[in-house]
Each structure stands twice: as structure tokens, then as C-alpha cells.
Amino acid sequence: MAVTACQGLGFVVSLIGIAGIIAATCMDQWSTQDLYNNPVTAVFNYQGLWRSCVRESSGFTECRGYFTLLGLPAMLQAVRALMIVGIVLGAIGLLVSIFALKCIRIGSMEDSAKANMTLTSGIMFIVSGLCAIAGVSVFANMLVTNFWMSTANMYTGMGGMVQTVQTRYTFGAALFVGWVAGGLTLIGGVMMCIACRGLAPEETNYKAVSYHASGHSVAYKPGGFKASTGFGSNTKNKKIYDGGARTEDEVQSYPSKHDYV
């Protein structure tokens, strides 16, 4: 039961995470104009991975896409790549994890297959989450660097009578969405990996070993191993990962919870 819950929860958390990664990637507010020097600006700038926007106090918003590929900063391209890789891995992970869910029966799929699929999806979710976190962090670092550079420029070159105020950008909502979503996907992946351990059936089924004592035959089963329970054609010897006694549910599955955001 605990394995099923862990796997299911891992799937749901990863799903939320991946949805968040997609949302963050599509959002326009990766960087927003810093309003420290002018909190009542009539023009508000914000930028995303794909376009930049200007919101006027009149109510009009104009967005323009980055129609050049070669003219964009390498860092921005890298962030785009990381986020897309995260999305793709997460999407594949979701697809795999759906079939790996213990509560879903597909033909005569064995527990070992489900365990492998759960582990695969968990790893995909972990990598997906890491990609998202890395992408957002690279962008944040870029913002911090540019912020202090523009601050330095703002206070130099003010010798003339005319002031040219340089627009500085700070963290936008998309960064926080991306960090949280990446974290959720990562956690979901870890949960899926944990669930995989619970799902994996025993490798070795020790047959009852007869010990002749007092002239009686007594079947002795060591505590760390489990005899075949008669589910399916359990002819292979399967080793249980955890030495402790478990319910059938616990042995069968652990929910994995790593989803891409």
C-alpha cells in the first residue's frame, strides 16, 4: 500500500512540477524592470525567453518576439535549451510513469518491468528537474551580473546635465515558478526511485530446506526472504531488497515522485 501511495504521489508531484516547468518556459516575466529608482513608471518592461514586452500605464501591452537566433546571447540560448530538455525529459518520464503505475494494469506486465519503468521515469524526472533548476539559475545569475553592471554604468557618466536612466532588470515571476517547479519534479523523481525499490520483486525464492530434527521434517524460511506467494508464474527465484517482512503491496510498489516542471 505504501509503495502504491509513494508511486502515485511521486507521479502527481512530478506532473505538477512538469506543468510548472512548461508554464515557466512560456512565461514572459523572466526578468522585470527594477522599479527601485522609479516606482511610478508610466512604462513597464519585462522579458521572457521568447519575447520582450512593454506595458504602458494606459493599459496597452506590446510584445515583440526575438526573431533572430544568431543575435541572441549564448546564455539565453543555453537557458532555452535546458528548459526544453527538461520539458522533453519530463514529458517522456510522465508517459513512462503512467504505464509503470501499480494501480494501472496493462496485460500481464510483470512487477519487475513496472519497477524498471518506475526507476526510468524517476531518473528522467530528476534530470528534468535539474535541467529546469539549472536553466533558471543560469538566467538568474545573468540578471544579477547585468544588474550590477548597469548600476555601475548608471552612476558613472552622469557628469552632464542630461540624465540617461538605464533600465535595470530584476527577477521575474517565471524564475520562482521555475525553481519551485524544478524542485517538485526533482522530489517527484526521487519518490519514483524510492517506489521502484518497493516494487522490485524478490530475486531468489529459497525453496523450503528440510532439516531433520527429532525425526520431523520442518520447513524453515529465513526471515529475510519470502516464499513464492503464487501470484502469476513465479518460478524464478527473486530476492527482496529489504530484509524486513513486508506486505504484498509494500513489496510490489513505491510511488515515485519526480516530475518535470
Epitope: 524592470q33 522609479n38 511610478v40 513608471t41 508610466a42 512604462v43 518592461n45 519585462y46 522579458q47 520582450s52 514586452c53 512593454v54 504602458e56 500605464s57 494606459s58 493599459g59 496597452f60 506590446e62 515583440r64 542630461v162 540624465q163 540617461t164 536612466v165 538605464q166 533600465t167
Partner: antibody, heavy 118, light 113 residues
Framework: QVTLRESGPALVKPTQTLTLTCTAS????????MSWVRQPPGKALEWVAT????????YYNPSLKDRFTISRDISANQLVLKVTNMDPADTATYFC???????????WGQGTTVTVSS | DIQMTQSPSTLSASVGDRVTITCKSS????????????LTWYQQKPGKAPKLLIY???TRESGVPSRFSGSGSGTAFTLTISSLQPDDFATYYC?????????FGGGTKVEIK
């Protein structure tokens, strides 16, 4: 077509409160920022206040102290300006205007002249 | 606050003349986000409400004759009337639409020579 019509008292005594109303028609009132601009006799235009489309944000001319309050009633398509503690220096023609692209004021009312005198 | 300075304050011209009015701002009105200058030009006739001529420093409002054109960037802007018509005798104002408080220039009165 877009029309803006200001209304309010023509004569106000000093220290009294002035309430001006601008009734809009011909456009989606809640989609545009609205402004009040005034012009003392023989002088230049002076921006007074602006309110955002939904009414969430208000902006005021800091040189006019805190006596001005701009608000809007979206259901009635009305823009309101309240000025407390009126002073003879507030004598002017008050215009309401719609903000458009570039924050430019593309439509203006005909203006209402307010005289502050005892 | 951004100060707007217009010159000249009064301009005498004849019908058919090319007229240029300048407007200077104490800070740049160029927005880096869309590379547009938030400067607006208005025309006002005595006893009437102002009329929008040009926004974004150079974009002509619909219905405004093509003889009116705006140019400039950053802190220096000009309004040009290529061939002055009798209907163009009025007062012209520039306005900062980039930063609150929105500020108007002192105005340039174009009168008949």
C-alpha cells in the same frame, strides 16, 4: 464615436471641495487609463492625475499636494476628480482625457471651467 | 521629475512656411524595452481642448495631416510642419509620457506673421 463630457460647478468658494465628473461613451471604459489635465487661464497644460483601466492604480502630480483624488465608476462609465480645500490658484479649465498607445491622450473632453472665488 | 523645455515660446510664420518646434527633456524618454521615445505632441486652439498629433515621438495619430511630422530621440525632439496652413495657427505642446509625473512643455504659439 468616442465622447468625453465633463460636468461640475463653475464657481467654488475657497476651502470648499470640488467634485468633477467625466462621463464617457463610445468605447470600453474599463480598457483605458483615464487622466485629468488642467489649464489655468493663459497658461500651459498641467497634468493632474491618471487612473488605470481597472481602477487599481492611481498616479498624481506631486506638486499639487494631496488634495486630489481620482476614481472611476466602471458601471456608470464615469471618471471622478475630487479636490479638497480649493484655492484661487486652482482656478482653471479642467479636461478629462483618455490614455491610449504611448500613454498619449487621444480623446479629450471639451473642458469645464472652474473659478475659485469668495 | 522630468522637465520639458520648448522653444521658441512664440513663432511668427506665414502660410506655406516650414515650421520647426523643438522640445528638450531633462532625462531620456527612450524606453530600452521597445526602443520607443515616449514623447507626445498636441495642438490646441483657443477655447478648445488639445488635439493629439504625434505619439512615440514620430508616430502620427490617425486623421492627422501628413504635413505634421515628429522626430528626435533621447532628450531632443522636433515637431515639423512642412507647409503651414491657415488651420495650423495654434499653440503646440510636447509632453513626457515616459515617467510620472507626466509633464508638459511650456507651449509654442504659432501666429500669423
Amino acid at each position: 464615436q468616442v465622447t468625453l463630457r465633463e460636468s461640475g460647478p463653475a464657481l467654488v468658494k475657497p476651502t470648499q471641495t470640488l467634485t468633477l465628473t467625466c462621463t464617457a461613451s463610445g468605447f470600453t471604459f474599463s480598457s483605458y487609463g483615464m487622466s485629468w489635465v488642467r489649464q489655468p487661464p493663459g497658461k500651459a497644460l498641467e497634468w493632474v492625475a491618471t487612473i488605470s483601466g481597472g481602477g487599481s492604480y492611481t498616479y498624481y502630480n506631486p506638486s499639487l499636494k494631496d488634495r486630489f483624488t481620482i476614481s472611476r465608476d466602471i458601471s456608470a462609465n464615469q471618471l471622478v476628480l475630487k479636490v479638497t480645500n480649493m484655492d484661487p490658484a486652482d482656478t482653471a479649465t479642467y479636461f478629462c482625457a483618455r490614455q491610449s498607445r504611448g500613454n498619449a491622450m487621444d480623446y479629450w473632453g471639451q473642458g469645464t471651467t472652474v473659478t475659485v472665488s469668495s | 521629475d522630468i522637465q520639458m523645455t520648448q522653444s521658441p515660446s512664440t513663432l511668427s510664420a506665414s502660410v506655406g512656411d516650414r515650421v520647426t518646434i523643438t522640445c528638450k527633456s531633462s532625462q531620456s524618454l527612450l524606453n530600452s524595452g521597445n526602443q520607443k521615445n515616449y514623447l507626445t505632441w498636441y495642438q490646441q486652439k483657443p477655447g478648445k481642448a488639445p488635439k493629439l498629433l504625434i505619439y512615440w515621438a514620430s508616430t502620427r495619430e490617425s486623421g492627422v495631416p501628413s504635413r505634421f511630422s515628429g522626430s528626435g530621440s533621447g532628450t531632443a525632439f522636433t515637431l515639423t510642419i512642412s507647409s503651414l496652413q491657415p488651420d495650423d495657427f495654434a499653440t503646440y505642446y510636447c509632453q513626457n509620457d515616459y515617467s510620472y509625473p507626466l509633464t508638459f512643455g511650456g507651449g509654442t504659439k504659432v501666429e500669423i506673421k
